[in-house]
């Protein structure tokens, strides 16, 4: 199953990067899972995911840094808190989980930079 | 004349970005002129340029927006003043000027990505 | 480090049942598809069903369906294989694998036989 | 369901050499194919995923190729460790399945 995302984002200065991840859906799929990873070297990662029913909304859990919405094949993805060091290439996985078959499809990924900002001066 | 510079480079908060440009030089050259040209769409500007010579510092003009410094066949190149708006492709630019025969080298250009930083809050 | 141990293997008569286990530690077992794959004496590698995640969703291949379940307990970290109704071309070693992030089967346990005989 | 096909069944080979073996599959599977390496006795161990890329810590004379409906993967010289039952799998859709596997054995 083919997935789209963008080759390069740019996270703000506040660590926020915001991306679309589209899918080819072979089939009606009603229940989707979507996960991002994080590639660094050859070590792949587990960013965030979540499960979502088709026309309902995609939910991470709380604690994650990851929010989304989706609408028909297309979920859009924010990563919040990012730092420089978070700097690297974030891939979109989905999974079409039901009903049967289950298919999966991978993006080629999309490398988000992230810059730290610079401290404001004291208020004196 | 073969040209390296990278491929990607991010600009500091402060709107600073840095890259190294290589060059091959073919014979012994005395005087080399490095320009730093910005593409974007098919337009291609010129952004600034300096002349020097084998050994001598690297000296832009005064209101130009980069410095920078030679080392051997390395010029070490710094543009500020940058925004998100000038975020696009910088390609450096040689020629071997003098003695004959002239060579020109043009890298494949380096990617500057310019992220504006958040405004700090005003003091009371 | 990564383990995945299957157990509960053994003889049994056609018709009967078995449970295998498979115990996975060293990872969080609830972010990640699990497969059983099987392989019966001298031949290749046969799927026989996966698992995923919070166990909700699972697949099967033709050869087991309605006669094998899979299930998980992501609290124990283990993995199940119920088999009812086994059969003499059920007899092979069965393997727990886990399914990598990018989605092959990057680990895999030591197998168990299971012989299915009169 | 999808088939995939292998071949040649048996590679008989000397030590050094340059192994080169096909997967076919019956319908497109991307570029999620995987090639395992089992010896006699021994659990399956991945070698390569997304047809091309290297699993952790396998010895770079392991290469793999394709999309589509035709990969390959080559071991460009062979060493004696190597010499073992390949299998490809494609885990792109349910129901999964395996190609039925090539023996590499020393000639």
């Known amino acids: 199953m083919h997935v789209a995302q963008p080759a390069v984002v740019l996270a703000s200065s506040r660590g926020i990067a915001s991306f679309v991840c589209e899918y080819a859906s072979p089939g009606k799929a009603t229940e989707v899972r979507v996960t991002v990873l994080r590639q660094a070297d050859s070590q792949v990662t587990e960013v965030c995911a979540a499960t979502y029913m088709m026309g309902n909304e995609l939910t991470f859990l709380d604690d994650s840094i990851c929010t989304g919405t989706s609408s028909g094949n297309q979920v859009n993805l924010t990563i919040q808190g990012l730092r420089a060091m978070d700097t690297g290439l974030y891939i979109c996985k989905v999974e079409l989980m039901y009903p049967p078959p289950y298919y999966l499809g991978i993006g080629n990924g999309t490398q988000i930079y992230v810059i730290d900002p610079e401290p404001c001066p004291d208020s004196d | 004349m073969h040209v390296a510079q990278p491929a990607v480079v991010l600009a500091s908060s402060r709107g600073i970005a840095s890259f190294v440009c290589e060059y091959a030089s073919p014979g012994k050259a005395t005087e080399v002129r490095v320009t730093v040209l910005r593409q974007a769409d098919s337009q291609v500007t010129e952004v600034c340029a300096a002349t020097y010579m084998m050994g001598n510092e690297l000296t832009f003009l005064d209101d130009s927006i980069c410095t920078g410094t030679s080392s051997g066949n390395q010029v070490n190149l710094t543009i500020q003043g940058l925004r998100a708006m000038d975020t696009g492709l910088y390609i450096c630019k040689v020629e071997l000027m003098y003695p004959p025969p002239y060579y020109l080298g043009i890298g494949n250009g380096t990617q500057i990505y310019v992220i504006d930083p958040e405004p700090c809050p005003d003091s009371d | 480090q990564v383990q995945l141990v299957e157990s509960g293997g053994g003889v049994v008569q056609p018709g009967r049942s078995l449970r295998l286990s498979c115990a996975a530690s060293?990872?969080?077992?609830?972010?990640?598809?699990i497969h059983w794959v099987r392989q019966a004496p001298g031949k290749g590698l046969e799927w026989v069903a996966v698992i995923w995640y919070d166990g909700r969703n699972k697949d099967y291949a033709d050869s087991v369906k309605g006669r094998f379940t899979i299930s998980r307990d992501n609290s124990k970290n283990t993995l199940y294989l119920q088999m009812n109704s086994l059969r003499a071309e059920d007899t092979a070693v069965y393997y727990c694998?886990?399914?990598?992030?990018?989605?092959?089967?990057?680990?895999w346990g030591q197998g168990t036989l299971v012989t299915v005989s009169s | 369901e999808i088939v995939l096909t292998q071949s040649p069944g048996t590679l008989s080979l000397s030590p050094g050499e340059r192994a080169t073996l096909s997967c076919r599959a019956s319908?497109?599977?991307?570029?999620?194919l995987a090639w395992y390496q089992q010896k006699p006795g021994q659990a399956p161990r991945l070698l390569i995923y997304g047809a091309s890329s290297r699993a952790t810590g396998i010895p770079d004379r392991f290469s793999g190729s394709g999309s589509g409906t035709d990969f390959t993967l080559t071991i460009s010289r062979l060493e004696p460790e190597d010499f073992a039952v390949y299998y490809c799998q494609q885990y792109g859709r349910s129901p999964f399945t395996f190609g039925p596997g090539t023996k590499v054995d020393i000639k």
């Open positions: 060293g990872f969080t077992f609830s972010s990640h598809g």
């Open positions: 319908q497109s599977v991307s570029s999620y």
């Open positions: 694998a886990r399914v990598a992030p990018l989605g092959p089967l990057d680990y």
